[in-house]
């Protein structure tokens, strides 16, 4: 969490951002909140990115002002206009690109004063894994698949029954480049699976951590998946 305060002259206002991550090809949110003003027309929101000459986005006098917007963000940004009055300056970024990663500044001017806060935005790809029983004539195996990851993640298997066991010798993980030549499909196979046990396939890179759990019994197979973004720090 980054909390920024205003500077000289007018009073300072508190601006708060949260470090976040964007999933390549999907829409992302750059979070920023500020002390609200009574009049929308008195609020100016400017989003800037370190190393980029033009603005990422500008909102003033109740509407978007995009004449100074940098080409790389053209047609891809929007604020939540109806929420600005209550202090929400968050930016929606469409079709997140790898190159969108970096340091952003949320700069606010209101009748009460000015303020800004920085935000670290990471980009990559992350997806929910699906774990299934794979069958071949010799033995049962578990297959953990996740369609989109970048950068290349690590994959670790764990078991409820054999806690602390190292499954690297009885598992095999492969990474297959997807058609857009950036993200990769993750496939990990675990051999010598025993029934009445819960197994977890954990996929992690510096952006996200995902877990696929499977409990295999004779009468049913229970599955659940979780995805957690890492380093979501507020400023």
């Amino acid at each position: 969490l980054i909390i920024g305060f205003g500077i000289s002259g007018r009073h300072s206002i508190t601006v708060t951002t949260v470090a976040s991550a964007g999933n390549i090809g999907e829409d992302g949110i750059l979070s920023c909140t500020f002390e609200p003003d009574i009049k929308l027309s008195d609020i100016v929101i400017q989003w800037l990115k370190e190393g980029v000459l033009g603005l990422v986005h500008e909102f003033k006098e109740g509407k978007d002002e995009l004449s100074e917007q940098d080409e790389m963000f053209r047609g891809r940004t929007a604020v939540f206009a109806d929420q600005v009055i209550v202090g929400n300056a968050s930016l929606r970024l469409k079709n997140v690109q790898l190159t969108d990663a970096g340091t952003y500044k949320c700069y606010i001017i209101t009748s009460k004063g000015k303020g800004n806060a920085n935000l670290e935005y990471k980009t990559g790809a992350f997806s929910m894994p699906e774990v299934n029983v794979d069958y071949n004539a010799s033995s049962e195996t578990l297959r953990c698949e996740a369609p989109r990851w970048f950068p290349q993640p690590t994959v670790v298997w764990a078991s409820q029954v054999d806690q602390g066991a190292n499954f690297s010798e009885v598992s095999n993980t492969s990474f297959e480049l997807n058609s857009e030549n950036v993200t990769m499909k993750v496939v990990s196979v675990l051999y010598n699976v025993t029934i009445n046990n819960t197994y977890s396939c954990m996929i992690e890179n510096d952006i996200a951590k995902a877990t696929g759990d499977i409990k295999v019994t004779e009468s049913e197979i229970k599955r659940r998946s979780h995805l957690q973004l890492l380093n979501s720090k507020a400023s």
Partner: antibody
């Protein structure tokens, strides 16, 4: 003994929503997942999804994601399935079944008609 | 999705007969297969799970076999109350899928 009780029939208009119930008894509700299955007239069975009543974790059949919403009320040991923006294609018998699908409700016949 | 196929949609047999209903999966599902009985009034009951395990309260005349992709349900001595439609279902992979059903009738 294990029982899953469902209303016999529901009649709703096209475009409307309906919330089907499945009241359970005879076992610990939160210890077993609940499944929902659809059967169109004269057709076979289609699995809609499953919900873990202990924490409301859900696995949907992608075909029904966005159409069906599964919920539970632990206090009354009841599972629900809401179907929205109904069309004639939704006219079917809907069953709830306790995981591992060992006990089934009698089914609710949903008729979507103006 | 895994396709489950019951090639025989209806089957006619005499009381006392040994009846076999088959089911095949489009890919290997190990032994993760259930058999259900649906009576004409719509009541559904689990007969067999994990290919060959008899569910509690199910008569021993019902048995199941198979592994991988090919499975069968056998009724050794057909009784009047066995007149129903029988469905196989795989639970190896989401979404769980059912066969089209085999309707059993008396000659």
């Amino acid at each position: 003994q294990v029982q899953l009780r469902q209303p016999g029939a529901e009649l709703v208009k096209p475009g409307a929503s309906v919330k089907l119930s499945c009241k359970t008894s005879g076992y610990t509700f939160t210890s077993y997942w609940m499944h929902w299955v659809k059967q169109r007239p004269g057709q076979g069975l289609e699995w809609i999804g499953e919900i873990d009543p202990s924490d409301s974790y859900i696995n949907y059949n992608q075909k029904f994601k966005g159409e069906a919403t599964l919920t539970v009320d632990k206090s009354s040991s009841t599972a629900y399935m809401q179907l929205s923006s109904l069309t004639s294609e939704d006219s079917a018998v809907y069953y709830c079944a306790r995981g591992p699908r060992d006990y089934w409700g009698q089914g609710t016949t949903l008729t979507v008609s103006s | 999705d895994i396709q489950m196929t019951q090639t025989t949609s209806s089957l006619s047999a005499s009381l006392g007969d040994r009846v076999t209903i088959s089911c095949s999966a489009s890919q290997g599902i190990s032994n993760y297969l259930n058999w259900y009985q649906q009576k004409p009034d719509g009541t559904v009951k689990l007969l067999i799970y994990y290919t060959s395990r008899l569910h509690s309260g199910v008569p021993s005349r019902f048995s199941g076999s198979g592994s991988g992709t090919d499975f069968s349900l056998t009724i050794s001595n057909l009784e009047p109350e066995d007149i129903a439609t029988y469905y196989c279902q795989q639970y190896s992979k989401l979404p769980y899928t059912f066969g089209g059903g085999t309707k059993l009738e008396v000659k």
